[in-house]
Structures are given as structure tokens and as C-alpha cells.
């Protein structure tokens, strides 16, 4: 129903805690250079705003729109222009024209320095003088690096922080129990943070039909005793939320995602068996549970696919009347037999499908013309199956950092144009996908590896959109959504690229690469190696092999030697030298 | 390859009216034809469409007062109670091969004229 | 229903100008169901444009179709004379009973 005040009626919904929260990560994915002090400011003049609001409906302003309240906000920080440059603009138009523009606007790799970890003693000492101000120290730093995260699942990452903080704080060895704690925390955020950008990329590329068909998919796959009209609901209310949150409309977003919450647990017996557990959880917790909760068990009896989608003699009719509710339906039915496919699959089979519909139902004698449809299926279900065996092969035989590197080399042969730090930082987190997926059960191998290389994958894409240097990468990226992942891996060495000439500095090294952390020594070398790469194309594995030992084995003797820089200076040249001959 | 309709006239208003779109060089039993409409000085109005199968689809507008048939090598669009509104040259045009529901014709005939005038 | 709302028309151009026309689509067209049509007084439709950007085979690479969803555009570069007529979007959509036509752009080459 309408509201009076959308403001008053949000912060009443949300309470101010949360409402504090979502308005600093609103204002700091919007407007990503400014300092923390800076947003607090202004979170705090709507927040004192909106009471005014919940105090009096009618006081001036209060029926303002969300947009236009806080896009005045915005718009009335001194030097703008300044600091945003043509970011500026968008305060001369009026909503919604203004709010779209801010939305262009975000910056998917602003050039901000990584988020550094505080050591121990010093986060315990201010969490502890004031857990307000650290928490939002942690929002309004993952938010401005990460303009799309879904808002809600930051204040659930943001109250796992306070927890662990809470708890480890309090014992001796402070550093020993955060680092664990707080990696694992980070590493799940980082997932949510593609896996929710690969979402308002769904959402803005191809439309809420494109977003709420995966959503059918997926909740189909997690609730295969659902009926179709409540997957359909349930998909409906899903795309509702997510449309919200990728549009920056985070606090609407977040009071519809509890409300979905709600509704799921007060629905169980219509939903799922396992949803228990999670809806005993306090809101955010409910919520992020209800996410990923485990997958029902499938009806025992289950008819035939061919049924309805290949023998019905009105197939062609259903089709044409109802391609969406034909399609979901079917879409719906495939998903919930098979759990073990991935959510991009499903979406090609369908495809295949309503493709084979729409050639076969013009002519004399569709049956006979799409009677071999789920025969056809087969190449596409073995096409991932295979990527997932070869690729869990091979992380299991070279572990992560193995795996990382022969991706690494794969990707820099498909896509040399690509920057260096692009190609590295893609390849490690593909690289991930072993560690993260490989050692599950065979049945959940598939739908791990291929949804998770997706978003990835859609990360490449955003950074090579914002400069197109590869051909190769243009045409996968701008194909549909679910054929990015087979097309990327389709590709082979580009041949049109004329290799980098050997330059001396690239490969040059000094001592202070000893000191540095693990992932750093590893982020160093993997540069080296697409360098290589980017020098020598075609190089064989082998030669690759070679030369990276001899790398590893020089930074082995000379971080160990006495006199490092010594050490690097007059073996590094000897190094290059032996690189060149060895790649000639 | 071509298409060519027949039938149009001038009928009073009431009068049904069935007109004909015949084709050569075309097996009708490989393609979708459908029939579009057009009023003097204004814009095509899709009416409806058969399938080589003989499955028939009508604009939500049209359903009711119009039929189209295959009776042989010819499809035929049958027209009842027509008005003063339904004066228009129609044109019978075949879907591109390959799509069944695309709005994709890619050969049109020369169209008919119907003026339904009392 | 559907509907599909062309803007502007009429619209001119001189020769060797460009022609940017748009359709609007309510609600989403199916799967880029979308085409363009050319017609000439006296003459039927001719399709340019299916898929949304997809030219049909012996239509000048001149014409460009564009859009998704809901925003539709064709671009007519570097026109000429024979480019004077009016043109049509054609959209399909959910059901086959929905295909429907824009209202149609008289293009004027002066």
C-alpha cells in the first residue's frame, strides 16, 4: 500500500541499526572516493530526517521520494565535480534520469588501494572503543570496492565481523583465532560480490525475464516439491528484490528480501522440508541461510520430461499461446529432476528447447520435427561434464596454485591483449574454483564449477568492457549470459596477436620480494609467467615449466642467500638469459 | 516464388467476405502464411496465422470474425460481419522458414482491396 | 495487449544524412522478436531487420538494427533517395496472438 512518508515507513520496517547501515552503503557505493567521515555525516542527516519523518508524516519533505532524498544528499557535497568529474552531471537531471545516471556511474574496479587487515591488537582496541564506528568502517569499505554487493547479505557479512570480533577479542592469543575467522568471512564475501554483480549484469543486459528464468531455475533445483505456481511466486518476489537492490534502491530491497523470508517460513509446508532450521535464525541470518539452504529431497515419483514437453499433442499449441508459462514450466520440470546441473546449463537446455519449439511447430509435422529434442540435450550436458572432469584433474594433480598458473597460461594464449594484472587476477580466482568446488560430491561438482566460472567470467567481461582490447573476449562477452563460459572455453590461442618483445625489466627482481606475504610472492611470479606468455605465445608447457622453476629456484637461493641483493643482481640477468635461451 | 490475393471488393456492411491467397513455386505444406492488413493512409495490423499443419492463430482482436483455411494449394481468410472499420487492402505474406511465431515475412503479396461501404 | 510505439514521424534527412528511428515495445518483446519493414506507396512491406539486428540477405549494410527488451532502434546511414517511404517495427511476443505492428515512420529524403 502507499505510504505518506517512503522514508518514515523504511525506517520504521528496518529499524535504525539496519536503516543506518544500507543508507552508508547506498551513499558509499554511489560515491566510491569519499572518506568514511564524509558519508557518516551525511548518513546521520537522514537518519535524524527520517525520525522527523516517522514523527510527522506531513513535515516538509517527508513525501519525497528515496531517490530524490538522497540524491540531494548527494548532490550537495562540496566539489563534486572535483572529485567525481563528469559524475557531476548527473546532478543537473532530474529523477529518474538522475539515479540512472549515478547507476552508470558506479566503477566496478575504482582505483582504491586494497583493504588492508588491520594486526590484531589494533582492531580489538577500536572495535572495542566504539563497534558503531568499525562496523561502518567495514560497510563503507566493502561497499565502495564493491558497488553492486547485495546490501542485506553485506549487514549479515558486517554482524559475522562483529561476532567473531566479539569473541576473539576476548582471548589471549587474539591473532590466531581472527585470521582463520575473518579469511573465511572474506573469502564468502568475495564470492557474494560476483555472484551478485553477475546478477544486476543479468538485470541490466538482458531484462527481469532473463534474471527471474534463473531464479526459476535455481529455486526449482532447491525445492523440487514446490508446485510451479509457488516457484513461480517465489522466483517473482526474488526478481523483485534483486531488480531493487541492483538499482541502488537498497532500503526497499532489504524490507522486501525479510518480507520473502517471512513469507518462505511461514510457507514451509508448501516449500521445502528443510527450511526449518533457518527460519528459527534471527532476521539476517535467516535470510543469508534461506540462500543457500540444502536441497529437498526430490518426489520419488516423478513422470517422464516427454510427457507434456515432447508426446502432448498440444505441445506446439502451449507454446505459441504461453511461451512463458510453456517455457517456465518446462524450465521448472528439467530443474528440479537434476539438482546435479548447473543453473547456466538448465538455461542453454531451455533454450534448445524453445529454439527446436520455434523452427519444428510452422511445419507439416512438428512431432516428427522436435520428437528428438532431449536426445539433442546430450552434447550440451557433456560439453560441462567434461570441463568439470578435465579441470578437477587437474587441480587435484597441481593444487591451487598449479591449477591458477596453467589457467593463467590457457586464458593469457586465448586473450594476450588483456592487461597483465586482469589476466592474473581472473586466473586466480578461476583457479579458485578447484579448491572450491572439486572436493564436493560428484552431483554437486557441476552446478559448483560452471555457476561459479560464470561469475568469474562476468567479471572479465565488466573490466574489458570498460577497455576493449581482445576480439576474443568482445565476442564472449557479448553473446547471451549462459553462452559466456562455453565460448570462453572454446577459445584457443589468438592467432591474430603479434608477440611482446622481450623486455629484461619485466623479468627483473629484487630482494624485496622475500619479505612479501605468500599471496604476494604468487601474484609476482603469475605476472612473470603471462608475461612469458605474452612473449611467447606458443610456447609448450614444458618450456613454461622450465623456465618457472628456474624462477621459483632462483627466488628459493637468493631470499636464502646471505647478501640478497647481491644475490639478485648478479644471478637475476643470468636468470633472463637462461629464460631466453629456453623459450627460443 | 510468389504470393497473390483474390476476393477484395466492395461489400455492404454484414456482408461476409472470403478472399484467397494463392502461391507459386511454394509447397504450402512447408510454410506458415500469415494475413496483415492495411487501412487506407494507416499502419499493418497483423490478423492472424496458419501453419503448414493447419494449426490456426488469430490476433486477440480478430478471434471470432475471422477464419483462415487451407483449403488446397490456396489459404483462405474468411471475413464476417464486417464494418466500415475492416476497409483495407489485405496482404497475405509467409513467415521466414525456420520460425513459427516471429513476426518474420519475408514474402508479401501485392494485397486486395476491401472497402466495406453501405 | 502489446504495443509498439515508433518515434518520430515523419522524419527527414538529406541525402547522405543519417535516419535514427525508434520503437518502443510495452511489455518486453519475446526473445529479441523484433523486425523492421520498409513499404513503399503502392507496394507490400519488404522485411530488412529480423532478431533485432539481423539483415536480411541483399538489404544494404546502410541499415542498422539495435535494442533489446523494451528499446528498439533502426539507423539509416548515409541515405539515399531510394530510402524515401515509411517504415514499420514488428514485434512478437509471450503469445502469437500479441504480434503486433508499430505505428509506422514516413522517412522524407530531401
Known amino acids: 500500500e502507499a505510504h505518506k512518508s517512503e522514508i518514515a515507513h523504511r525506517y520504521n520496517d528496518l529499524g535504525e541499526q539496519h536503516f543506518k547501515g544500507l543508507v552508508l552503503i547506498a551513499f558509499s557505493q554511489y560515491l566510491q572516493k569519499c572518506s568514511y567521515d564524509e558519508h557518516a555525516k551525511l548518513v546521520q542527516e537522514v537518519t535524524d530526517f527520517a525520525k522527523t519523518c516517522v514523527a510527522d508524516e506531513s513535515a516538509a519533505n517527508c513525501d519525497k521520494s528515496l531517490h530524490t532524498l538522497f540524491g540531494d544528499k548527494l548532490c550537495a557535497i562540496p566539489n563534486l565535480r572535483e572529485n567525481y568529474g563528469e559524475l557531476a552531471d548527473c546532478c543537473t537531471k532530474q529523477e529518474p534520469e538522475r539515479n540512472e545516471c549515478f547507476l552508470q556511474h558506479k566503477d566496478d574496479n575504482p582505483s582504491l588501494p586494497p583493504f588492508e587487515r588491520p594486526e590484531a591488537e589494533a582492531m580489538c582496541t577500536s572495535f572495542k572503543e566504539n563497534p558503531t564506528t568499525f562496523m561502518g568502517h567495514y560497510l563503507h569499505e566493502v561497499a565502495r570496492r564493491h558497488p553492486y554487493f547485495y546490501a542485506p547479505e553485506l549487514l549479515y557479512y558486517a554482524e559475522q565481523y562483529n561476532e567473531i570480533l566479539t569473541q576473539c577479542c576476548a582471548e589471549a592469543d587474539k591473532e590466531s583465532c581472527l585470521t582463520p575467522k575473518l579469511d573465511g568471512v572474506k573469502e564468502k564475501a568475495l564470492v557474494s560480490s560476483v555472484r551478485q554483480r553477475m546478477k544486476c549484469s543479468s538485470m541490466q543486459k538482458f531484462g527481469e525475464r532473463a534474471f527471474k528464468a534463473w531464479a526459476v531455475a535455481r529455486l526449482s533445483q532447491t525445492f523440487p516439491n514446490a508446485d510451479f505456481a509457488e516457484i513461480t511466486k517465489l522466483a517473482t518476489d526474488l526478481t523483485k528484490v534483486n531488480k531493487e537492490c541492483c538499482h541502488g534502491d537498497l532500503l526497499e530491497c532489504a524490507d522486501d528480501r525479510a518480507e520473502l523470508a517471512k513469507y518462505m517460513c511461514e510457507n514451509q509446508a508448501t516449500i521445502s522440508s528443510k527450511l526449518q532450521t533457518c527460519c528459527d535464525k534471527p532476521l539476517l541470518k535467516k535470510a543469508h541461510c534461506l540462500s543457500e539452504v540444502e536441497h529437498d529431497t526430490m518426489p520419488a515419483d516423478l513422470p517422464a520430461i516427454a510427457a507434456d514437453f515432447v508426446e502432448d499433442q498440444e505441445v506446439c499449441k502451449n507454446y505459441a499461446e504461453a511461451k512463458d508459462v510453456f517455457l517456465g514450466t518446462f524450465l521448472y520440470e528439467y530443474s528440479r529432476r537434476h539438482p546435479d546441473y548447473s543453473v547456466s546449463l538448465l538455461l542453454r537446455l531451455a533454450k534448445k528447447y524453445e529454439a527446436t519449439l520455434e523452427k519444428c511447430c510452422a511445419e507439416a509435422n512438428p512431432p516428427a520435427c522436435y520428437g528428438t529434442v532431449l536426445a539433442e540435450f546430450q552434447p550440451l550436458v557433456e560439453e560441462p561434464k567434461n570441463l568439470v572432469k578435465t579441470n578437477c584433474d587437474l587441480y587435484e594433480k597441481l593444487g591451487e596454485y598449479g591449477f591458477q598458473n596453467a589457467i593463467l597460461v590457457r586464458y593469457t594464449q586465448k586473450a594476450p591483449q588483456v592487461s597483465t594484472p586482469t589476466l592474473v587476477e581472473a586466473a586466480r580466482n578461476l583457479g579458485r574454483v578447484g579448491t572450491k568446488c572439486c572436493t564436493l560430491p560428484e552431483d554437486q561438482r557441476l552446478p559448483c564449477v560452471e555457476d561459479y566460472l560464470s561469475a568469474i567470467l562476468n567479471r572479465v567481461c565488466l573490466l574489458h568492457e570498460k577497455t576493449p582490447v581482445s576480439e576474443h573476449v568482445t565476442k564472449c562477452c557479448s553473446g547471451s549470459l549462459v553462452e559466456r563460459r562455453p565460448c570462453f572455453s572454446a577459445l584457443t590461442v589468438d592467432e591474430t596477436y603479434v608477440p611482446k618483445e622481450f623486455k629484461a625489466e619485466t623479468f627483473t627482481f629484487h630482494s624485496d620480494i622475500c619479505t612479501l606475504p605468500e599471496k604476494e610472492k604468487q601474484i609476482k611470479k603469475q605476472t612473470a609467467l603471462a608475461e612469458l606468455v605474452k612473449h611467447k605465445p606458443k610456447a609448450t608447457a614444458e618450456q613454461l615449466k622450465t623456465v618457472m622453476d628456474d624462477f621459483a629456484q632462483f627466488l628459493d637461493t637468493c631470499c636464502k642467500a646471505a647478501d640478497k641483493d647481491t644475490c639478485f643482481s648478479t644471478e637475476g640477468p643470468n636468470l633472463v638469459t637462461r629464460c631466453k635461451d629456453a623459450l627460443a | 516464388q510468389s504470393l497473390e490475393e483474390s476476393g477484395g471488393r466492395l461489400v455492404t456492411p454484414g456482408t461476409p467476405l472470403t478472399l484467397t491467397c494463392t502461391v507459386s513455386?511454394?509447397?504450402?505444406?512447408?510454410?506458415?502464411i500469415n494475413w496483415v492488413r492495411q487501412a487506407p493512409g494507416k499502419g499493418l495490423e497483423w490478423i492472424g496465422i496458419i501453419w503448414a499443419s493447419g494449426t490456426t492463430f488469430y490476433a486477440t482482436w480478430a478471434k471470432g470474425r475471422f477464419t483462415i483455411s487451407r483449403p488446397s494449394t490456396t489459404v483462405d481468410l474468411e471475413m464476417t460481419s464486417l464494418t466500415t472499420a475492416d476497409t483495407a487492402t489485405y496482404f497475405c505474406?509467409?513467415?521466414?522458414?525456420?520460425?513459427?511465431?516471429?513476426?518474420?515475412?519475408?514474402?508479401w503479396g501485392p494485397g486486395t482491396l476491401v472497402t466495406v461501404s453501405s | 495487449a502489446a504495443v509498439l510505439t515508433q518515434t518520430p514521424s515523419p522524419v527527414s534527412a538529406a541525402v547522405g544524412g543519417t535516419v535514427t528511428i525508434n520503437c518502443q515495445s510495452s511489455p518486453s518483446v519475446w526473445s529479441n522478436f523484433l523486425s523492421w519493414y520498409q513499404q513503399k506507396p503502392g507496394q507490400p512491406p519488404k522485411l530488412l531487420i529480423y532478431?533485432?539486428?539481423k539483415l536480411t540477405s541483399g538489404v544494404p549494410s546502410r541499415f542498422k538494427g539495435s535494442g533489446s527488451g523494451t528499446q528498439f532502434t533502426l539507423t539509416i546511414s548515409d541515405v539515399q533517395c531510394g530510402d524515401a517511404a515509411t517504415y514499420y517495427c514488428?514485434?512478437?511476443?509471450?503469445?502469437?496472438?500479441?504480434?503486433?505492428f508499430g505505428g509506422g515512420t514516413k522517412v522524407v529524403v530531401k
Open positions: 532478431e533485432a539486428s
Open positions: 513455386g511454394i509447397d504450402l505444406s512447408n510454410y506458415a
Open positions: 505474406a509467409r513467415t521466414v522458414p525456420g520460425y513459427s511465431t516471429a513476426p518474420y515475412f519475408d514474402l
Open positions: 514488428g514485434g512478437g511476443y509471450s503469445s502469437i496472438s500479441d504480434t503486433t
